[in-house]
Amino acid sequence: APISSHCRLDKSNFQQPYITNRTFMLAKEASLADNNTDVRLIGEKLFHGVSMSERCYLMKQVLNFTLEEVLFPQSDRFQPYMQEVVPFLARLSNRLSTCHIEGDDLHIQRNVQKLKDTVKKLGESGEIKAIGELDLLFMSLRNACI
């Protein structure tokens, strides 16, 4: 099980209307450029076999991947939203830096790896899809971690 006190984000992180709106606007703009509507990255398969107490740890992994492998490489696109949303998400990632899991997290890593593989397989369109799902990432992170 996770060290649950560390796998928490204060509700106030998600109660900032401006940055919430910018995150959703960024997702909307990117989703307009997403041609592949059949694939969903953040959905049931990602959370398959993951207990309630492990969800935040899983979302931390997804957040870190999204920042490092998607948002940083695409940081010049979708302005002005990107320059505001990326630092916000990076702060959330930093606040979850002490969120770890005790024991076996293989099932979580397996699920996250499938998401990573899907993004990589789709190439740049996979990165655009991930940005287009930032609203789902934001909401899933909130629901899992508060």
């Epitope: 099980a1 509700k11 998600f14 953040i42 959905g43 049931e44 959370f47 398959h48 076999g49 993951v50 207990s51 309630m52 107490s53 969800r55 609203d135 789902l136 909401m139 899933s140 909130r142 629901n143 899992a144 508060i146």
Partner: antibody, heavy 119, light 112 residues
């Protein structure tokens, strides 16, 4: 095919106990949480409680103490133990699978089993 | 605990009509709202989640919208099989788990 079948309902006297069963097929209880919801005659839906993948249970405040959810993974069955039953517990009781997609959604549902509490 | 208020509690409509049902939450629930359809003597069936995402196999005449406290379920052209009761349902995280899942009171759609 995913299926949920409730059983164990019937007529019970006030103060009595009853154990409902929800037999599932097409998926594993080690991969999904399960919820119980009830519906009094002509009324709306009311959440009772949930049993998570790891066996943790959570209950609506009104259900704590009288209602207990458990499971037997080897039988792929979830149970709802109801004690100290009252007339107002008369309802159709449903089990449903909790699919977390970033938010909890309940799909599919069993057909329900009717519990009548009366003397 | 969040309270979901559905309106109207019942409505009469004809086949082909556009039907709109609203669900108001007593506090901000973001997009943590689902809609279910229940026919007499049957179990509820998931229609919409994330406030606006259509569940698998649900006809495109159903749509959902809203966020925060105000939500809408729309049936663009009512079909004979759509006469049923519709429930909204919210998930509230971060507070006590004993009030995490809440249902609205329901809206019965009847034949005019």
């Amino acid at each position: 095919e995913v299926q949920l079948v409730e059983s164990g309902g019937g007529l019970v006297q006030p103060g009595g106990s009853l154990r409902l069963s929800c037999a599932v097929s097409g998926f594993s209880l080690s991969s999904y949480a399960m919820i119980w919801v009830r519906q009094a005659p002509g009324k709306g839906l009311e959440w009772i409680g949930i049993i998570d993948i790891d066996g943790s249970t959570y209950y609506a405040s009104w259900a704590k103490g009288r209602f207990t959810i458990s499971r037997d993974s080897s039988k792929n069955t979830v149970y709802l133990q109801m004690n100290s039953l009252r007339a107002e517990d008369t309802a159709v009781y449903y089990c449903a699978r909790d699919r977390f997609v970033g938010v909890d959604i309940f799909d599919p549902w069993g057909q329900g089993t009717l519990v009548t509490v009366s003397s | 605990a969040v309270v979901l208020t559905q309106s109207p509690s019942s409505l009469s409509a004809s086949v082909g009509d556009r039907v709109t049902i609203t669900c108001q939450a007593s506090e901000d629930i973001y997009t943590n709202l689902a809609w279910y359809q229940q026919k007499p003597g049957k179990a509820p069936k998931l229609l919409i989640y994330w406030a606006s995402t259509l569940a698998s196999g649900v006809p495109s005449r159903f749509s959902g919208s809203g966020s925060g406290t105000d939500f809408t379920l729309t049936i663009s052209s009512l079909q004979p099989e759509d006469f049923a009761t519709y429930y909204c349902q919210a998930c509230v995280y971060g507070d006590s788990a004993d009030s995490r899942y809440t249902f609205g009171g329901g809206t019965k759609v009847e034949i005019k």
